[in-house]
């Protein structure tokens, strides 16, 4: 059984995780630019289930694709540095899911332009952490 | 113990630009996120911001976007909020807080010509 | 961006009082809600985090509840020090966002 240092660290690793998601949506929000367009025409693979540490293997799998999206971003407004950015991320994932995983993704038929991608990792994140609080 | 100390009250003009630092101590300076929340007097409460203070990205309001620009030293554990192109209203108290259970005990920043 | 409206503005009680303030937010914010109280020319202090977790320290007269898009904080037997004025906040989605807050007075 999990302790309760392993919780607070599982949580706070989500919390981590749950703040960067939230950056990138906020800066492309607040993006006032024609490549906004360009970039919602990209499109995400999106995990058929997310309900277990586990399916961040679904989110790892994305996060070169989303460097090169952010990558079309960048401007003196937008102020997240995509290569920090998803390494960041990427850490945070890895010791989320636990790099030993054999877990193979299965994706939606769907698929998903940032925007949605991200909302669907933030809501991934919110309904963990409100299940460890 | 856990604290956030932020630099001295401030006075400057319209256009100008002033740079508030939070120190904190007493824990990990990486562990958690830092936001800079201001509060005009007799006004409520709006964020401004949150910085990585790991990686140092950011994500500012709309609102304070172009003006705002927070950065950090890992190795003062310190991060700082420049704001520029000062105006009237921009006359606040600012406070950091780390992951919202720490919070600086503020900077008032008047600008006045 | 979420709007987040506190209801009332002020109120006036008597230290033994139980006191009642409600936060509704424009859209849900399932249970991403916090509260502060702060004290003239003092930060705020975080008194309840996700809807209805007491942070350490905080005295159990204080109570949060609700979820989704209206939430309640009650200080089930007023004491002298709790005079001040509380602000809800999200922190569903970004920009994070307050109340206007609720001032709290001696009647």
């Known amino acids: 059984a999990p302790t309760s240092s392993s919780t607070k660290k599982t949580q706070l690793q989500l919390e981590h995780l749950l703040l960067d998601l939230q950056m990138i949506l906020n800066g492309i929000n607040n993006y006032k630019n024609p490549k906004l367009t360009r970039m919602l025409t990209f499109k995400f693979y999106m995990p058929k289930k997310a309900t277990e540490l586990k399916h961040l293997q679904c989110l790892e799998e994305e996060l070169k694709p989303l460097e090169e999206v952010l990558n079309l971003a960048q401007s003196k407004n937008f102020h997240l540095r995509p290569r920090d950015l998803i390494s960041n991320i990427n850490v945070i994932v890895l010791e989320l899911k636990g790099s030993e995983t054999t877990f193979m993704c299965e994706y939606a038929d769907e698929t998903a332009t940032i925007v949605e991608f991200l909302n669907r990792w933030i809501t991934f994140c919110q309904s963990i952490i409100s299940t460890l609080t | 113990q856990v604290q956030l100390v932020q630099s001295g009250a401030e006075v400057k003009k319209p256009g100008a630009s002033v740079k508030v630092s939070c120190k904190a101590s007493?824990?990990?300076?990486?562990?958690?996120?830092m936001h800079w929340v201001r509060q005009a007097p007799g006004q409520g409460l709006e964020w401004m911001g949150i910085?990585?203070?790991?990686?140092?990205?950011?994500s500012y309001a709309l609102k304070f976007q172009g003006r705002v620009t927070m950065t950090r030293d890992t190795s003062t554990s310190t991060v700082y909020m420049e704001l520029s192109s000062l105006r009237s209203e921009d006359t606040a108290v600012y406070y950091c807080?780390?992951?919202?259970?720490?919070w600086g005990q503020g900077t008032l920043v008047t600008v006045s010509s | 961006d979420i709007q987040m409206t506190q209801s009332p503005s002020s109120l006036s009680a008597s230290v033994g009082d139980r006191v009642t303030i409600t936060c509704r937010a424009s859209?849900?914010?399932?249970?991403?809600l916090a509260w502060y109280q702060q004290k003239p020319g003092k930060a705020p202090k975080l008194l309840i985090y996700?809807?209805?977790s007491l942070d350490e320290g905080v005295p159990s007269r204080f109570s949060g509840s609700g979820s989704g898009t209206d939430f309640t904080l009650t200080i089930s037997s007023l004491q002298p020090e709790d005079f001040a004025t509380y602000y809800c906040?999200?922190?569903?989605?970004?920009?994070?966002?307050f109340g206007q807050g609720t001032k709290v007075e001696i009647k």
């Open positions: 007493g824990y990990t300076f990486t562990r958690y996120y």
């Open positions: 859209q849900s914010i399932s249970t991403w």
């Open positions: 906040q999200q922190s569903y989605s970004f920009p994070v966002t």
């Open positions: 910085i990585n203070p790991r990686a140092g990205y950011t």
């Open positions: 996700a809807a209805s």
């Open positions: 807080t780390s992951g919202w259970e720490v």
